[in-house]
Interface confidence: low
């Protein structure tokens, strides 16, 4: 009779993270009598995943009943696959001996091969807000896929950078990968609305990458411009000051008046009108009763914004050619700012 | 073996849907996409879709994104294409064919399905 | 969408010659991580597709060595160096990397 072969069909199987792996074996006769082992890896670091004979291996089922005396499949299922489980399967058939089984022959192997889709990317940018012109990092990371081959592009409003660094870790073979990707943008001011996109492409994506986004909203400060300006008279003694604040962002800002450098009124910004890029306009107005003050006056208007060191802009009231009413004591009257705006 | 097998024929009515089968065997169902091809005479052939059977992830040519559905079921490792709204342009052969992830190849196709739309 | 043009429309080749098939894309069909996913499939007379070549030049389990892909970027090269009865039918180019994925609209090869 023809020598006893051990033949699995399959030289690889690709299963899905999760899923059941079936690797597949048959002998090609019942003698000589003995079990059946399965083995990942071969050689002496050969790790045990499957004996006939005895052990509990909860993952492992057999596709046909092992103890029917003329069985000659020993084909197994392993359940949950995991990146982990990836490598070379042995079936090896053993020949009953005493007191210990010997091995008598081995089949040519199975390659598991674990497809594991990586993560949604995450786009993280820095902690603190930059001006326009500053260079900030944003980072990318995508875990626990494999095989290790992945890309990764950046963009910013649909267009490719190239300033940016890359590393696929480990090094060496491992059972899952993970990505890690630093790049460089200069910001604008129009970057407001501007997104950054992290983009990530593997094999088991099917050609449809995975993308994660930062908003350059969270990343920016766009510092405003100020002008003061005098309006035309309103009444014989009072004239209207307007500082307008323009293009700034985020939205948090305070402005004060001052008067010959004493504070005058200090305001949040509220009700403020949004350019097309996405930046905030403001006006706040002073009325000075020109008639209590004797001499030319320094108005100031100072803004802080988004907790940053004030800026200032002042303007010289002429007050000279203004006859001086006797009796009134109020420098400036207190006026809502909101209400009016040029925008 | 690998194997794909799809009904033969349909006959439906304008208007109406049909929810084609393939079911597959000699594989594990879940570690490679399906895809769904049209097929009308003289025409070619037309890329519809495909999915993942481990997630249900999806990719559709735009072209049938409204037109076609794909579904599968993993207990009994068969994938479904449910066309809607049917009128004589979506007479065809429909066939399922086996995706290998790693270089996107339909390596396996079922035999088809003929779809014939008519009142 | 990429379109796929082959050319010829169809082929009369004698047993035992060599027949070129080639497929043009309208924009290059590299992949985004490097891969060109070219592929040819063949459809028999009254039989389903069946894959001959993946990646632009592997050639699929069981494929006779005489079938022989090439090419790069947009322009493709199906060739047979021995053609055999069995040959005949319809190939198609298929491109894989930019979805929706396209077929070329085939070309007939028949025997003389």
């Known amino acids: 009779e023809e020598e006893l072969q051990v033949i699995q069909p399959d030289k690889s199987v690709l299963v899905a993270a999760g899923e059941t792996a079936t690797l597949r074996c048959t002998a090609t006769s019942l003698i000589p009598v003995g079990p059946i082992q399965w083995f990942r890896g071969a050689g002496p670091g050969r790790e045990l995943i499957y004996n006939q004979k005895e052990g509990h291996f909860p993952r492992v089922t057999t596709v046909s009943d092992l103890t029917k005396r003329n069985n000659m499949d020993f084909s197994i299922r392993i359940g949950n696959i995991t990146p982990a489980d990836a490598g070379t399967y042995y079936c090896v058939k053993f020949r009953k001996g005493s007191p210990d089984d010997v091995e008598f022959k081995s089949g040519a192997g199975t390659e598991l091969s674990v497809r594991a889709k990586p993560s949604a990317p995450v786009v993280s940018g820095p902690a603190a807000r930059a001006t326009p012109q500053h260079t900030v990092s944003f980072t990318c990371e995508s875990h626990g896929f494999s095989p290790r081959d992945i890309t990764l592009k950046w963009f910013k409003n649909g267009n490719e950078l190239s300033d940016f660094q890359t590393n696929v870790d480990p090094v060496g073979e491992s059972v899952s990968y993970s990505i890690h990707s630093t790049a460089k943008v200069v910001l604008t001011r129009e970057d407001v609305h501007s997104q950054v996109i992290c983009e990530v492409a593997h094999v088991t994506l099917q050609g449809d990458p995975l993308r994660g986004t930062a908003n350059l909203s969270e990343t920016i400060r766009v510092p405003p411009t100020l002008e003061v300006t005098q309006q035309p008279v309103r009444a014989e003694n009072q004239v209207n000051v307007t500082c307008q604040v323009r293009k700034f962002y985020p939205q948090r800002l305070q402005l004060t008046w001052l008067e010959n450098g004493n504070v005058s009124r200090t305001e949040t910004a509220s009700t403020v009108t949004e350019n097309k890029d996405g930046t905030y306009n403001w006006m706040s107005w002073l009325l000075v009763n020109v008639s209590a003050h004797r001499d030319d006056v320094k108005l100031t208007c100072q803004v802080e914004h988004d907790g940053q060191p004030a800026v200032s802009k002042s303007h010289d009231l002429k007050v000279s050619a203004h006859p001086k009413e006797q009796g009134s004591n109020t420098a400036a009257e207190n006026t809502g700012s909101n209400e009016r705006n040029i925008y | 073996q690998v194997q794909l097998q799809q009904p033969g024929a349909e006959l439906v009515r304008p208007g109406s849907s049909v929810k084609l089968s393939c079911k597959a065997s000699?594989?594990?169902?879940?570690?490679?996409?399906m895809h769904w091809v049209k097929q009308r005479p003289i025409q070619g052939l037309e890329w519809i879709g495909n999915?993942?059977?481990?997630?249900?992830?999806?990719h559709y040519n735009q072209k049938f994104k409204d037109k076609a559905t794909l579904t599968v079921d993993k207990s009994s490792s068969t994938a479904y294409m449910q066309l809607s709204s049917l009128t004589s342009e979506d007479s065809a052969v429909y066939y399922c064919?086996?995706?290998?992830?790693?270089?996107?190849?339909?390596?396996?196709w079922g035999q088809g399905t003929s779809v014939t739309v008519s009142s | 969408d990429v379109l796929m043009t082959q050319t010829p429309l169809s082929l009369s080749v004698s047993l035992g010659d060599q027949a070129s098939i080639s497929c043009r894309s309208s924009?290059?069909?590299?992949?985004?991580?490097?891969?060109?996913?070219l592929e040819w499939y063949l459809q028999k007379p009254g039989q389903s597709p069946k894959l001959l070549i993946y990646?632009?030049?592997n050639r699929f389990s069981g494929v006779p060595d005489r079938f022989s892909g090439s090419g790069s970027g947009t322009d493709f090269t199906l060739k047979i160096s021995r053609v055999e009865a069995e040959d005949l039918g319809v190939y198609y180019c298929?491109?894989?990397?930019?979805?929706?994925?396209?077929f070329g609209g085939g070309t007939k090869l028949e025997i003389k």
């Open positions: 064919a086996r995706g290998y992830s790693k270089y996107y190849a339909m390596d396996y």
């Open positions: 000699g594989y594990t169902f879940t570690s490679y996409w």
């Open positions: 999915i993942d059977p481990s997630d249900s992830d999806t």
């Open positions: 924009q290059s069909i590299v992949h985004s991580y490097g891969n060109t996913y």
């Open positions: 990646k632009v030049s």
């Open positions: 298929f491109q894989g990397s930019h979805v929706p994925y396209t």
